[in-house]
């Protein structure tokens, strides 16, 4: 029985013949015929074809826009497109990284549990029991309440998840 | 299963003719280029002779052309080579092959000899 | 003609080892280079095409490289299974010319 597909991987029909794709970093310029091989060409400047491929067009390389806040991670080749990355302090909206947001700040109350990266927004999480954040960071964690007992001292005002505790000096029984 | 089996190899006196089938199956036989490669006893491998997919394109080596023919049957999925005026140094063994771009000798039969001898 | 220039024509390797094998080709070929591995009795096989591309079912020790008109095939870890012979073939242009071969054997 005949396989499914009459030509290979890298191959394409085309009357009655199986030509061969063109490599990546280059694009057809001719198919093959019986007399001659597929004719391709290299991709220009600022264009890639990434795959075996029969694109009369090569693809334009990605445009990382500094007005979006873009800038280039890695440069593209013939067979790369470029990859964009955000500048300091701003992350990818998307997969694509087409554009950038500010990092998101944790509001006190919240620490942040992951910071940011070029492609992730902070996660932030709420302070548990026994810590607190009093700013609004995109880099602080939840702080642990102070422990009076370690210094000597004795709680006077509670914390809170937006606040250390206070505290005081015991109150010594006068003889 | 692409598969090439060749057949018609031998003993065969310098001067005289033989002719080498190759039986394709597994694939559209039509769509693909087709050589014989030949393998020397104490030498090593020797292209011999490439035809186009419907034979109107036929390429040999200097040393066989005039004596060698390439040709096939696509309606049969079988490539032939006829060898006439047979010398000592044509003894080897003969493989059918694709030679398909950008793959080229992809498939390989498991060969025939061919000892040219008196 | 094409001349390919293949080195070394033996080879003595221990099992685990990395080794190389290369061809030259005496005028431009661009990436029309195939590797074969040849078993005793047995037909030749595709290993990689067009100089880099492993071709299907080969272990991806191997591997297809090229440097201006020298071109290697190299076997990153060997195996007992990979002993036999190996050459190369252009296929740029008629006639199409072979390496004279390697041998490669376990030490």
């Known amino acids: 029985p005949e396989p499914p597909t009459a030509c290979r991987e890298k191959q394409y029909l085309i009357n009655s013949q199986c030509c061969s794709l063109c490599q990546p970093g280059q694009k057809l310029v001719s198919d093959c015929t019986e007399f001659t091989e597929t004719e391709c060409l290299p991709c220009g400047e600022s264009e890639f074809l990434d795959t075996w491929n029969r694109e009369t067009h090569c693809h334009q390389h990605k445009y990382c826009d500094p007005n979006l806040g873009l800038r280039v991670q890695q440069k593209g080749t013939s067979e790369t497109d470029t990859i964009c990355t955000c500048e300091e302090g701003w992350h990818c909206t998307s997969e694509a990284c087409e554009s950038c947001v500010l990092h998101r700040s944790c509001s006190p109350g919240f620490g942040v549990k992951q910071i940011a990266t070029g492609v992730s927004d902070t996660i932030c999480e709420p302070c548990p029991v026994g810590f607190f954040s009093n700013v609004s960071s995109a880099f602080e964690k939840c702080h642990p309440w102070t422990s009076c007992e370690t210094k000597d001292l004795v709680v006077q005002q509670a914390g809170t998840n937006k606040t250390d505790v206070v505290c005081g000096p015991q109150d010594r029984l006068r003889a | 299963e692409v598969q090439l089996v060749e057949s018609g190899g031998g003993l065969v006196q310098p001067g005289r003719s033989m002719k080498l089938s190759c039986a394709a199956s597994g694939f559209t036989f039509s769509y693909f280029p087709m050589a014989w490669v030949r393998q020397a006893p104490t030498k090593g491998l020797e292209w011999v002779a490439t035809?186009?997919?419907?034979?109107?394109?036929?390429y040999y080596r200097d040393s066989v052309k005039g004596r060698f023919t390439i040709s096939r049957d696509n309606a049969k999925s079988t490539l032939y080579l006829q060898m006439n005026s047979l010398r000592s140094e044509d003894t080897a063994t003969y493989y059918c092959?694709?030679?398909?771009?950008?793959?080229?000798?992809?498939?390989w039969g498991q060969g025939v000899m061919v000892t040219v001898s008196s | 003609d094409i001349q390919m220039t293949q080195s070394p024509s033996s080879i003595s390797v221990s099992l685990g080892d990395r080794f190389t094998i290369t061809c030259r080709a005496s005028?431009?070929?661009?990436?029309?280079l195939n590797w074969y591995q040849q078993k005793p009795e047995k037909s030749p096989k595709l290993m990689i095409y067009r100089a880099t591309n492993l071709e299907d079912g080969v272990p991806s020790r191997f591997s297809g490289s090229r440097s201006g008109s020298d071109y290697s095939l190299t076997i990153n870890s060997l195996e007992s299974e990979d002993t036999g012979f190996y050459f190369c073939?252009?296929?740029?242009?008629?006639?199409?010319?072979f390496g004279s071969g390697t041998k490669l054997e376990i030490k």
């Open positions: 035809i186009s997919t419907s034979g109107g394109n036929i």
């Open positions: 073939v252009q296929h740029k242009q008629y006639p199409l010319t």
């Open positions: 092959t694709r030679d398909t771009a950008p793959y080229y000798f992809d498939y």
């Open positions: 005028q431009d070929i661009g990436n029309y």
